[in-house]
Interface confidence: medium
Amino acid sequence: WELTILHTNDVHSRLEQTSEDSSKCVNASRCMGGVARLFTKVQQIRRAEPNVLLLDAGDQYQGTIWFTVYKGAEVAHFMNALRYDAMALGNHEFDNGVEGLIEPLLKEAKFPILSANIKAKGPLASQISGLYLPYKVLPVGDEVVGIVGYTSKETPFLSNPGTNLVFEDEITALQPEVDKLKTLNVNKIIALGHSGFEMDKLIAQKVRGVDVVVGGHSNTFLYTGNPPSKEVPAGKYPFIVTSDDGRKVPVVQAYAFGKYLGYLKIEFDERGNVISSHGNPILLNSSIPEDPSIKADINKWRIKLDNYSTQELGKTIVYLDGSSQSCRFRECNMGNLICDAMINNNLRHADETFWNHVSMCILNGGGIRSPIDERNNGTITWENLAAVLPFGGTFDLVQLKGSTLKKAFEHSVHRYGQSTGEFLQVGGIHVVYDLSRKPGDRVVKLDVLCTKCRVPSYDPLKMDEVYKVILPNFLANGGDGFQMIKDELLRHDSGDQDINVVSTYISKMKVIYPAVEGRIKFS
């Protein structure tokens, strides 16, 4: 019996087609992805093959103005239109709190939404009961397939799930649910979830009875043969893990942003054992036409976005200096504003010993592309912010050793004075440079804001300590020459859309007046 699994993950609000790097589509003939194009390909496969499942491994939420405006209603609407068979909850599905998940998505979705390792307690338990499930048995042709869901247990540090959801260890939570499916005589089981490729592989190895793992969160690109675009494969598709009981378990992921449709064919024997698995992600490029009915629907929903982008988010009573003459040479108040917004977006009261789990932000000055003039009645719009942050990136959470941070700050000024983009803007950090010293030895003082304290204060950076830092995904990926961050990071979790982070902060503060306050000094 053959099953075709079509899968997406980490789509992050890319409902419209995008350019090759998943930013806003400029030249339509070279654009990719989007739900209209995805639907064309899905329908084509559904017509050609008998047993097809369309699955999503989480993080539909967050990433473009679509989510800012529609807050998840767009996800439910278009996933329903594409007739997804199941979805796993990702960490970003909690970005607007549990209410922001229940109302727009859980109550509106016509497909099961899954997670076996999220347990509700207190008053939320009855409110959310039945709206998401640990597993679902789906009829496919003459057979049944069990889908068990899972979500990163780090979600409380990455999003806003509140205090009435407990995120358990994935493997511990999955095993009893898989065992339950086995007792129901379901012998073909897919683990669908959002914990990253390393956890996907562990699930394949450890959870007895799981036949296939379809994952997300780490934006992992797998491919067999010559890859069709810029993404470099992390391994073959499917990635085969040998389980503890000696089975071959295929593990798949399909990069991110709806650029690819994962396509996996699995052959099962009569006892539900995987005999063979093969496939590859399908690049959704312009050779695949956009479905006209879905495209028309997208255009209808778009109208509200155009109106939103010119509405006032808040006011500034000071000039927001985002000029390259400032942000690439010294502390600039636009950099301070963005970093403050980045920290504010990551306020998660860990426990009584920590005021917050993260206190530091770094931001490449070259990523700040425009100032905002306060003399336009102080008005700040989404459109203004899109000029400041035009690249459609995310502000991510990483863990780095102090020694890596020190290298990053040395890199920040290693060729100072040439208006290069690597000059770092900061938050929760006080740095002093001596430019008379040779490159690689110019940081003379580097103090960081404590997290394990009730009154935040600045302490000298410790080389061997592990610190959490918020930074643009561009830096996490080694951009602007920050290779040491990419090579030495101990953990990387993708965060929220950059403009959304700043716009939310401005809306929350209502009136802003960021200053230059001595975060970056030269001795």
Partner: antibody, heavy 112, light 107 residues
């Protein structure tokens, strides 16, 4: 229950080849790796390679690559290990093993 | 290749003794480690997989644990049928490798 039953002892001359069989029962043969391990007299265990009967996929220990050939016949649920260019130091007990269960072993003696 | 170094190579113990065998991996193998028991003239028998999971039918006096890249097999109260050679085996990377064995003898 799972059983792996191997073929009988063999005596071979140096330079010859030997083919050991391993018949599986009690589980779905095509869905689990079969490993081959050898043990020289009084020595420890040495992994030779593995085969996945479902698709014929193999992984070899480089010490045996080129001399060992692993095959599997799904129709009879039997795995085979052929070792060529035998020398006296290949005298050993050869085991087939799943991840939990082992065959009884086959003694291969290489002597002129 | 991943090397597994077992210690001791042999030990003498009495019935009822608590016995500990250690296996050190040359690099990180997670918990992809098996413990096998082999009696003279017999095939090895798997006791523990995934560092600490007991195979069905294996007495609970056997247990496995890990600290970093050091793996331990413990027999809490040695029984007459436990006198044998014990091997660790990793299945984290190719080639699969074994420890050199620990022979448990009667004192």
């Amino acid at each position: 229950q799972v059983q792996l039953v191997q073929s009988g002892a063999e005596v071979k001359k140096p330079g010859a080849s030997v083919k050991v069989s391993c018949k599986a029962s009690g589980y779905v043969f095509s869905s689990y790796w079969i490993n081959w391990v050898r043990q020289a007299p009084g020595q420890g265990l040495e992994w030779m390679g593995q085969i996945y009967p479902g698709d014929g996929n193999t992984n070899y220990n480089r010490n045996f690559k080129g001399r060992a050939t692993l095959t599997a016949d799904k129709s009879t649920s039997t795995a085979y290990m052929e070792l060529s260019s035998l020398r006296s130091e290949d005298t050993a007990v050869y085991f087939c093993a799943g991840f939990a269960d082992w065959g009884q072993g086959t003694l291969v003696t290489v002597s002129s | 290749d991943i090397q597994l170094t077992q210690s001791p190579s042999s030990l003498s113990a009495s019935v009822g003794d608590r016995v500990t065998i250690t296996c050190r991996a040359s690099q990180d193998i997670g918990d992809s480690l098996i413990w096998l028991q082999q009696k003279p003239g017999k095939a090895p028998k798997r006791l523990i997989y995934a560092t600490s999971s007991l195979d069905s039918g294996v007495p609970s006096r056997f247990s496995g644990s890990r600290s970093g890249t050091d793996y331990t097999l413990t027999i809490s109260s040695l029984q007459p049928e436990d006198f044998a050679t014990y091997y660790c085996q990793q299945y984290s990377g190719y080639p699969l490798t074994f420890g050199q064995g620990t022979k448990v003898e009667i004192k």
